[in-house]
């Protein structure tokens, strides 16, 4: 069922079908006998009770006040009253733009990131049973789409998709043809969510070790979901059975990015593990960044400046 009209201030375009639905609808069915009234006041005018006799354009149903169509002089305040329940709306009817297929003041703006999923579906659940056909226009040019009941665009966004998309529903009521237009201003922007991945800590790390012992080299980065973090060492990774890449750990940050950590475990350190580069790389669509570790025998650490020590 169509949800009730909860917004207290509503702007609509002249010449289109429009409805107000009060928000105690389920309650109203329970108390069928209760008197339910709709009122309008505009400017200094007192409340005027609305009924089908007050205008051929107005229809009253259980929970709904319908306009066929709404016109400029329908601007004003509307009230629904039932027992001790009252709901009020302020309705502003604006002029249709005669030179365009849509009215600029009645446009919903959406920002879509390039390559992200982009969807426009032309639906109108309230008038669904009365709609004969629906057309989708881009910048007021009709798009040729297969489904003329609910035209839909579903794709990965491209910059060329930017523009004004208007869903126009054509419907009949009491022998007259009406249309309802819903327009979206779609702006395609670059992927704003991507950060340049950052490897945490110094770019070059000398690690003091003892032969025969084990060491864990921790590489941490702040990165995007798609970014990869990996270790490179030796001629061909995996040639040394004493070197193991541990499973990557990822924690999502409050900003929706990822804090990743990948440990390289070197067991039973031998001479061949000393003074060689163990590189940790983070790669993204923006490029790569690398951090290097060098294992140095504890006795040799005296030759290295203090600020490059890592333990």
């Amino acid at each position: 069922a169509e949800s009730c009209t909860s917004r207290p201030h509503i702007t609509v375009v002249e010449g289109e079908p429009f409805y107000l639905k009060h928000c105690s609808c389920s309650l109203a069915h329970e108390i069928e006998t209760t008197t339910k009234s709709w009122y309008k006041s505009s400017g200094s005018q007192e409340h005027v009770e609305l009924n089908p006799r007050s205008s051929s354009r107005i229809a009253l149903h259980d929970c709904v006040l319908e306009f066929w169509p709404v016109e400029l002089n329908d601007t004003g305040s509307y009230f629904f009253q039932m027992k001790n329940y009252t709901q009020k709306w302020k309705l502003n009817v604006i002029r249709r733009n005669k030179h365009s297929c849509f009215t600029e003041r009645q446009v919903t703006s959406k920002i879509v990131e390039v390559k992200k999923f982009f969807q426009i579906t032309c639906e109108n659940s309230y008038y669904q049973t009365l709609v004969n056909s629906t057309s989708l226009y881009k910048n007021c040019k009709k798009l040729l789409l297969e489904n003329n009941k609910n035209p839909t665009i579903k794709k990965n966004a491209e910059f060329e998709d930017q523009g004004y998309y208007s869903c126009v529903h054509f419907l009949h009521h009491n022998g007259k043809l009406f249309n309802i237009t819903k327009t979206f201003n779609i702006t395609i922007v670059e992927d704003r969510s991507n950060i340049v991945p950052v490897l945490l800590g110094p770019k070059l790390n000398h690690v003091a070790v003892e032969l025969g012992k084990n060491v864990r080299l921790n590489c941490s980065a702040l990165l995007n979901e798609e970014d990869v973090i990996y270790w490179m060492f030796g001629e061909e990774n995996g040639s040394d059975p004493n070197i193991h890449e541990e499973k990557e750990m990822r924690i999502m940050t409050p900003e929706g990015k990822w804090h990743a950590s990948k440990v390289l475990r070197i067991e039973n350190i031998g001479e061949s593990n000393l003074n060689v580069l163990y590189n940790c790389t983070v790669a993204s669509t923006g490029g790569t960044d690398t951090k290097s570790f060098i294992l140095v025998r504890k006795a040799d650490m005296a030759d290295i400046p203090g600020h490059v020590f890592t333990r």
Partner: antibody, heavy 115, light 113 residues
């Protein structure tokens, strides 16, 4: 729209150097790396290396290490690829491409190395 | 380096028929941390730069007809053209972007039977 515009064709002598430019427009240059890919006549695609437009970090294919240099000029959103000590087997169309899967390509620059 | 091997080297298919190109990587390009396959497919016509068709192994690039689809995971991948059109005649390449150097397959030449 998003595009990469490359410099024109070149004819070089063996031992010489070449420098191809690739000007980006329609997107934020520093958000994407630029890869260079070459294609010898009638052959497949060979990745030469790439550069991060954000921080200038480079990563080159092993076989070109020492002969190739990739640079960027963020003020003009332009990437450059220089290849030195040219040989006849460097004759190829050189492409610049965006990102790590290459969604935008330049039209290519034909470089002919001949004595 | 990760070696990409395509099969077959060339393929002749009738118009309207299905075309299938395979690509095998020498090591997995599936990243367990995000379950993404770092594999792309390109189409190249004579005298033109390659054109991206598929990335993340199965995501179709915007503007690419839906007769093109990508599948597979780990080391084995497939590009399928469900109903071959005349304009699909080209060389097709797979490429891994999991580890540098980013390597391409040798290419598969697709022709009309």
């Amino acid at each position: 729209q998003v595009q990469l515009v490359q410099s024109g064709a070149e004819v070089k002598k063996p031992g010489a150097s070449m420098k191809v430019s690739c000007k980006a427009s329609g997107y934020t240059f520093t958000n994407f790396g630029i890869s260079w890919v070459r294609q010898a006549p009638g052959q497949g695609l060979e990745w030469m290396g790439w550069i991060s437009a954000y921080n200038g970090n480079t990563n080159y294919a092993q076989k070109l290490q020492g002969r190739v240099t990739m640079t960027t000029d963020t003020s003009t959103s332009t990437a450059y690829m220089e290849l030195r000590s040219l040989r006849s087997d460097d004759t190829a169309v050189y492409y610049c491409a965006r990102g790590w899967f290459f969604d935008i390509w330049g039209r290519g620059t034909l470089v002919t190395v001949s004595s | 380096d990760i070696v990409m091997t395509q099969s077959p080297d060339s393929l002749a298919v009738s118009l309207g028929e299905r075309a299938t190109i395979n690509c095998k990587s020498s090591q997995s390009v599936l990243y367990s941390s995000n379950n993404k396959n770092y594999l792309a497919w390109y189409q190249q016509k004579p005298g033109q730069p390659p054109k991206l068709l598929i990335y993340w192994a199965s995501t179709r690039e915007s503007g690419v007809p839906d007769r093109f689809s990508g599948s597979g995971s780990g080391t084995d991948f497939t590009l399928t053209i469900s109903s071959l059109q005349a304009e699909d005649v080209a060389v097709y390449y797979c490429q891994q972007y999991y580890r540098t150097p980013y390597t391409f397959g040798q290419g598969t030449k697709l022709e009309i039977k």
